[in-house]
């Protein structure tokens, strides 16, 4: 019992429960093919308690094995539209600091209109996870489309 | 030492360990679009450990981030078949109470037979989850193609 | 400050933190239709804290509710190639000990080059896990497509 | 109400080509696969293949290649079989049929049928 | 292609009576959890009428008196009480793959 009320007591990031979901807020200008994040309970249902947004992009904060999430639905799309328009590929990875540069996480549309997917990796603080989004198709908006996001799992 | 044992002597509801794995029971009638879950050891490796079931959808028990996520494979299912008969769509939402009604992930099959998805949501104590299968494809009903499950990530 | 100090001072397999995160190390000869993983550090970012590789497959050490995920991507793929080699089929299941077995998850490829996934299942000590690919086709060995995983999440 | 109203019946020479229409009703037509199903008088019923108006995507029984051609008018709600190279075998009743509510090969709805009779 | 092997191939059953009929696929016919049979009745200078879908569905509109199950490769249609309407021919059908087959029918008549 005094576990419990002690556990409830302690603030939750000295536990390493950092966690974070982002909507997509805007893509970059058309040389630069970042997904530019967003997050905060006034966006919705997306929230950052422990990792920061830095330009859009998510910085850790905390060191450990996170479990990283994506979900990235082409806008107005049929699989007709996504053949046509291949390859459009969607990579996740650290792309700061420079010397940690590195993909996490890659998958390519080809014929479907969403891409969905999920893995397990160290990350430290300080790393700054982009995600690439390569082609000439736009990432849809809608909250229930397109997210991203990343679990502290242990340090 | 005195920690860990305290922590196993401790119901693991009080550490807010809610999970849930569910398994397809069936579709609703015609006009009903919702799928209808079934969980327990009884009917192989699904399991209920804190939100209940009701009337086949999901309810919370606790309030908090939950990692959900979803497979759902159609019955017999070629790409000729998944590409003849678009949209074939799949949405989690919460669907009560109705003051809460929000779609949270949303996929479409286009030239697939499958879509697989997870993401961090907040949920409150009461929110019953519903999966809603738009078209006019079949789910199959088999344990490894179609689960839907929760897990308790932090307050 | 205490409890977090305690906390740290015991070791994480106390705490029943155990993960893993594996890499593609090769494909078995002709009839075996098993995928052969590889982690640790030094290969990479892939790691095994508590379960263990036992011939390329992994084997779990503690008992509990398992987060199960895994990306395969077939190699030099395109839409074309998927649907002209189908089925090509990707399942993980318990391979041993034989009492054990079952299809814990089960995915075709269809049209698409990629397929991940996840879900929540317990395991036991001693439950071997094996990806099996049917098909023609090669998996990637990119570790950024593909990865298989396991997270502790229960008791 | 759903209706499948089919043309009237046929007496062709053998050698000769047929070609039988199903119209449409009570329902949005490029919705619904149509099926066709052969039926040999006093025996049992033999699908040959479908239609689906929407994207004029068709299949057919390994049987019946070359033997049916399945084409549709969206503007009429009318699907259309057209039977080549007509023998005393292809004498029978054939059925246009609609599936159920889902998307699969079980036929709810059917037409009353249009005979077909080959004979010099 | 699947063979549907209908028994008997015709039968008598008295008013009121059960009259059961079976269907033997070649192979399963169960796939995805469902078992892909239906069975309709067929009465002369008729079309064929959907009476059970999935092996047990009973279609919209048919009397429970019309009753369907089985799985893998043996099913039955089961009607009772039989009445007198019942007389005409009934066959199962499989949708598991293409091209879906029929069984060769079972005449029922009403004694």
């Known amino acids: 019992q005094r576990f419990a009320q002690a556990q409830q007591q302690l603030p939750l990031e000295s536990l390493g429960w950092d966690v974070a979901e982002l909507q997509l807020n805007h893509t970059g200008p058309q040389q630069d093919p970042r997904l530019y994040w967003q997050g905060g309970p006034a966006l919705g249902r997306s929230f950052l308690h422990g990792p920061e947004l830095d330009k859009g992009q998510l910085r850790i904060h905390r060191d450990g094995i996170y479990m990283v999430h994506i979900q990235v639905t082409l806008a107005i799309c049929s699989s007709t539209t996504a053949s046509r328009h291949h390859p459009t590929t969607l990579a996740v990875g650290i792309c700061s600091p420079a010397s940690r540069s590195i993909s996490l996480l890659r998958l390519s549309f080809h014929q479907g209109c969403t891409i969905a997917s999920q893995r397990l990796t160290p990350l430290a603080r300080g790393d700054t996870l982009c995600t690439n989004l390569t082609g000439t198709l736009l990432p849809s908006r809608n909250t229930d489309e397109t997210f991203f996001g990343v679990q502290w799992v242990r340090p | 030492q005195r920690f860990a044992q305290a922590q196993q002597q401790l119901p693991l509801e009080s550490l807010g360990w809610d999970v849930a794995e569910l398994q397809l029971n069936h579709t609703g009638p015609q006009q009903d679009p919702r799928l209808y879950w079934q969980g327990g050891p009884a009917l192989g490796r699904s399991f209920l450990h804190g939100p209940e079931l009701d009337k086949g959808q999901l309810r919370i028990h606790r309030d908090g981030i939950y990692m959900v996520h979803i497979q759902v494979t159609l019955a017999i299912c070629s790409s000729t078949t998944a590409s003849r008969h678009h949209p074939t769509t799949l949405a989690v939402g919460i669907c009560s109470p109705a003051s809460r009604s929000i779609s949270l992930l949303r996929l479409s099959f286009h030239q697939g037979c499958t879509i697989a998805s997870q993401r961090l949501t907040p949920l409150a104590r009461g929110d019953t989850l519903c999966t809603n299968l738009t078209g006019t494809l079949l789910p199959s009903r088999n344990t490894d193609e179609t689960f839907f499950g929760v897990q308790w990530v932090r307050p | 400050q205490r409890f977090a100090q305690a906390q740290q001072q015991l070791p994480l397999e106390s705490l029943g933190w155990d993960v893993a995160e594996l890499q593609l190390n090769h494909t078995g000869p002709q009839q075996d239709p098993r995928l052969y993983w590889q982690g640790g550090p030094a290969l990479g970012r892939s790691f095994l804290h508590g379960p263990e590789l036992d011939k390329g497959q992994l084997r779990i050490h503690r008992d509990g509710i398992y987060m199960v995920h895994i990306q395969v991507t077939l190699a030099i793929c395109s839409s074309t190639t998927a649907s002209r080699h189908h089925p090509t089929t990707l399942a993980v299941g318990i391979c041993s000990p034989a009492s054990r077995s079952i299809s814990l998850l089960r995915l075709s490829f269809h049209q698409g080059c990629t397929i991940a996934s996840q879900r929540l299942t317990p395991l036991a000590r001693g439950d071997t896990l094996c990806t099996n690919l049917t098909g023609t086709l090669l998996p990637s060995r990119n570790t950024d497509e593909t990865f298989f995983g396991v997270q502790w999440v229960r008791p | 109400e759903v209706q499948l109203q089919q043309s009237g019946p046929e007496l062709v020479k053998p050698g000769a080509s047929v070609k039988m229409s199903c119209k449409a009703s009570?329902?949005?037509?490029?919705?619904?696969?149509i099926h066709w199903v052969k039926q040999k008088p006093g025996q049992g019923l033999e699908w040959i293949g479908y239609l689906h108006p929407y994207n004029d995507d068709t299949k057919y029984n390994e049987k019946f290649k070359g033997k049916a051609t399945l084409t549709s008018d969206k503007s009429s709600s009318t699907a259309y079989m057209e039977l080549s190279s007509l023998t005393s075998e292809d004498s029978a009743v054939y059925y246009c049929?609609?599936?159920?509510?889902?998307?699969?090969?079980?036929?709810?709805?059917w037409g009353q049928g249009t005979l077909v009779t080959v004979s010099a | 292609d699947i063979v549907l092997t209908q028994s008997p191939a015709s039968l008598a059953v008295s008013l009121g009576q059960r009259a059961t009929i079976s269907c033997r696929a070649s192979k399963s016919v169960s796939a995805s959890g469902y078992t892909w049979i239906h069975w309709y009745q067929q009465k002369p200078r008729q079309a064929p009428k959907l009476l059970i879908y999935l092996a047990s569905n009973l279609e919209s509109g048919v009397p429970a008196r019309f009753s369907g199950s089985g799985s893998g490769t043996d099913f039955t249609l089961n009607i009772h009480p039989v009445e007198e309407e019942d007389a005409a021919t009934y066959y199962c059908?499989?949708?598991?793959?293409?091209?879906?087959?029929f069984g060769g029918g079972t005449k029922l008549e009403i004694k």
């Open positions: 009570g329902y949005t037509f490029t919705d619904y696969v």
């Open positions: 059908q499989h949708s598991r793959e293409l091209p879906p087959t």
């Open positions: 049929a609609r599936r159920g509510y889902y998307d699969y090969a079980w036929f709810a709805d």
